[in-house]
């Protein structure tokens, strides 16, 4: 049975040009966590695999970093990265854990992080 | 340029370990790298069997879990796979791969060696 | 585990001619896709990774797209060197599995 819940930093905006840190944490579970996806609709952004460390895809790589912890952080923001995240926790035994995180870009400088909440 | 080589007994008989050598030279398994085993059966299907990471942690595929084991030796830049408990089910050509976390993809590739398990 | 289904095990073409490959998986793997081409008497060798990106050295006359499920790698003129077996191989969980493979034969 599946009794984890994975916390994210929710609905989140950042200005244009700047950077953000996406931050999943999960909880209430003793499974082993394999590997963290990271993913922007239908396009992979990085993968932390426990043994390997991080991979960042080639798409990514001028603008991902990774960290911290099992987060990422994303560069050089533009409008065009409003959108969901998600980040998708391979664990064993339990499965899969997906966390999803809105990130909206904004011109001006009025951006401020969202309230955390949880998704079972 | 990284060079990879496996070695070990052609012919195993059932109910016995499989034990297969890869080689690597050119680049040290403690660099960087997934240092993989995966194996082709006859039909031309490939299983990837699991890998023992740079750092040595080692990683199954499940199917496999109860019967697998690699292993590495650092000073001579070698890793290993035991196989128990083989049946006719387990001949195939056995592969050594390295994975990069650059590509995560299987960039350089033994030439295999066939195994025939049969008494 | 994640099956990837190659739907044509054989597939006749000519030289010069554009030739298709699909691979289905059966659960979202995003675009944590890579190809591998394997000649007779041969290893697999790397020719795409990231669903679409060319491994150093080949040529780009190999083409790889699709995300999600569904992954297309083409050829866009098939040379007499190219015959062998393709497969399609997802990372984007543990266990990495492979696809059946297709042959590419000469008509």
């Known amino acids: 049975m599946m009794t984890g819940t994975i916390e994210t930093t929710g609905n989140i905006s950042a200005e244009k040009g700047g950077s953000i840190i996406l931050q999943c944490h999960l909880s209430s579970t003793t499974a082993q966590v394999t590997q963290v996806n990271w993913e922007q609709q239908d396009q992979l952004l990085a993968i932390c695999n426990a043994d390997l460390g991080w991979h960042i895809s080639p798409s990514f790589k001028d603008r991902v970093a990774p960290g911290p912890g099992l987060g990422l952080t994303l560069q050089s923001l533009t409008v065009n990265d409003t959108g969901e995240y998600f980040c998708i926790y391979h664990t064993y035994p339990d499965g899969t854990y997906t966390g999803r995180i809105f990130l909206e870009v904004l011109e001006s400088s009025v951006a401020e992080h969202g309230a955390r909440f949880q998704i079972p | 340029d990284v060079q990879l080589q496996e070695s070990g007994p052609g012919l195993v008989k059932p109910s016995q370990s499989l034990s297969l050598t890869c080689t690597v030279t050119?680049?040290?398994?403690?660099?960087?790298?997934?240092w993989n085993w995966i194996r082709q059966f006859p039909g031309n299907r490939l299983e990837w069997m699991g890998y023992i990471s740079y750092s040595g942690a080692p990683r199954y595929n499940p199917s496999l879990k109860s019967r697998i084991s690699i292993t590495r030796d650092t000073s001579k830049n070698q890793f290993f796979l035991q196989l128990s408990f083989v049946t006719t089910e387990d001949t195939a050509t056995y592969y050594c791969?390295?994975?990069?976390?650059?590509?995560?993809?299987?960039?350089?590739w033994g030439q295999g060696t066939s195994v025939i398990v049969s008494s | 585990d994640i099956v990837m289904t190659q739907s044509h095990k054989f597939m006749f073409t000519s030289v010069g001619d554009r030739v298709s490959i699909t691979c289905k998986a059966s659960?979202?793997?995003?675009?944590?896709v890579a190809w591998y081409q394997q000649k007779p008497g041969q290893s697999p060798k790397l020719l795409i990774h990231?669903?679409?990106y060319r491994y150093t050295g080949v040529p780009d006359r190999f083409i790889g797209r699709g995300s999600g499920t569904d992954f297309t790698f083409t050829i866009s003129s098939v040379q007499a060197e190219d015959l062998a077996v393709y497969y399609c191989q997802q990372y984007y969980s543990l266990p990495w599995t492979f696809g059946g493979g297709t042959k590419l034969e000469i008509k």
């Open positions: 050119g680049y040290s398994i403690t660099s960087d790298y997934a």
């Open positions: 659960q979202h793997v995003s675009n944590a």
């Open positions: 791969a390295s994975l990069g976390t650059d590509y995560y993809a299987m960039d350089y």
């Open positions: 990231s669903a679409s």
